[in-house]
C-alpha cells in the first residue's frame, strides 16, 4: 500500500528533521494526493482511449465537478486568502462522492484509489485547521450525493470510464489550482 | 527529470522588448508547470513568473506585472516569457525551471529540474 506523507523510510531515518510546518503539511499531503491520482490515470488511460479525447470534447459532460473561477479568489488577480481557502474546502467536500465512485473502478490501483481518498479525507482536516471562517464551509447534502453515487453507478461501461477519466483529470487540475494558491498563503 | 534549454537573451534598450524561450525534449513537458527566475550579479536568485499545466494558472512577481507575459505552446514543448518596457534591473541571468507536479510557485525548491541561465542585458 502507498505510505502516507510523513511515514516514508527517509523520515524515519532522519530522526531529528525539523517537524514539519502545517504549511509544508499540507504541500505534502496534496503532492501525494496528486501522485496517486497519477498512478490511477495510468490505469484508466492503459485500460481505454479517454485520455486521447480532447479537453473540448470531454467538456460535453453533465458532471458538475468543482473547478476554480476567477471569483473563487484562487488566482493572482483578485486573490483573496480566506475566500479561496473556503473555496478549497468545499471543492473537496464536494470531490468526496466522486472519490467513493471511484472505488472497486480499478483492478490493479484498488488500494491506492482507497489512498487517494482517505489522504483527501486527512487533507481536508488540515485545511479546517487553518481556515478561520468555517461558517462559509457549505457540506453537501448526503442524500443528494447518495442519489448522485447510485446514478453514476448505473451508467453503461462507456459513460463510466469517461466519468472516471473526467473526475480523476478535474481533481488533478483542483488541486494543481489549489496547492498553486496555498503556496501564496 | 527533464532537460531545460533557456534561449532568447540578448543586449536590449531600456524599454525595448525581448522574448525568452524554455525549450525541453521530455515527452510529457506538458504535465510541468514552469516557472522563471532570475538572478543579477551579487543578488539572491528570485521569482520572476509560473505557468501551471493549465495555462490559464499564471502568476507574476510584482515587479514584472503588466510588463512580462509567460505563456506555453505544448506541441512545441517550450514555455515563454515575454519581456517588454524592460528596465537596467531587469538586467540578470534567466533561468527556467520545471515543476513535475504540475504546480509551480515563487520558490525555488518547488522545482526539481533547472536550465543553465540566458543573459539579459538591458543598457543604453
Known amino acids: 500500500a502507498p505510505v502516507p506523507p510523513g511515514e516514508d523510510s527517509k523520515d524515519v531515518a532522519a530522526p531529528h528533521r525539523q517537524p514539519l510546518t502545517s504549511s509544508e503539511r499540507i504541500d505534502k499531503q496534496i503532492r501525494y494526493i496528486l501522485d496517486g491520482i497519477s498512478a490511477l490515470r495510468k490505469e484508466t488511460c492503459n485500460k481505454s482511449n479517454m485520455c486521447e479525447s480532447s479537453k473540448e470534447a470531454l467538456a460535453e459532460n453533465n458532471l458538475n465537478l468543482p473547478k476554480m473561477a476567477e471569483k473563487d479568489g484562487c488566482f493572482q488577480s483578485g486573490f483573496n486568502e480566506e475566500t479561496c481557502l473556503v473555496k478549497i474546502i468545499t471543492g473537496l467536500l464536494e470531490f468526496e462522492v466522486y472519490l467513493e465512485y471511484l472505488q472497486n473502478r480499478f483492478e490493479s490501483s484498488e488500494e491506492q484509489a482507497r489512498a487517494v481518498q482517505m489522504s483527501t479525507k486527512v487533507l481536508i482536516q488540515f485545511l479546517q485547521k487553518k481556515a478561520k471562517n468555517l461558517d462559509a464551509i457549505t457540506t453537501p447534502d448526503p442524500t443528494t450525493n447518495a442519489s448522485l453515487l447510485t446514478k453514476l453507478q448505473a451508467q453503461n461501461q462507456w459513460l463510466q470510464d469517461m466519468t472516471t477519466h473526467l473526475i480523476l483529470r478535474s481533481f488533478k487540475e483542483f488541486l494543481q489550482s489549489s496547492l498553486r494558491a496555498l503556496r501564496q498563503m | 527529470e527533464v532537460q531545460l534549454v533557456e534561449s532568447g537573451g540578448g543586449l536590449v534598450q531600456p524599454g525595448g522588448s525581448l522574448q525568452l524561450s524554455c525549450t525541453t525534449s521530455?515527452?510529457?513537458?506538458?504535465?510541468?508547470?514552469v516557472g522563471w527566475f532570475r538572478q543579477a550579479p551579487g543578488k539572491e536568485r528570485e521569482f520572476v513568473a509560473d505557468?501551471?499545466?493549465?495555462?490559464?494558472?499564471?502568476w507574476y512577481a510584482h515587479s514584472v506585472l503588466g510588463r512580462f507575459t509567460i505563456s506555453r505552446d505544448d506541441a512545441k514543448n517550450t514555455v515563454y516569457l515575454q519581456m517588454d518596457s524592460l528596465k537596467p534591473e531587469d538586467t540578470a541571468v534567466y533561468y527556467c525551471?520545471?515543476?513535475?507536479?504540475?504546480?509551480?510557485?515563487?520558490?525555488?525548491?518547488?522545482?526539481?529540474?533547472w536550465g543553465q541561465g540566458t543573459q539579459v542585458t538591458v543598457s543604453s
Open positions: 525551471a520545471a515543476d513535475k507536479y504540475g504546480v509551480g510557485g515563487n520558490a525555488q525548491g518547488y522545482y526539481d529540474s
Open positions: 521530455g515527452r510529457r513537458f506538458s504535465e510541468y508547470a
Open positions: 505557468i501551471g499545466e493549465q495555462a490559464e494558472n499564471t
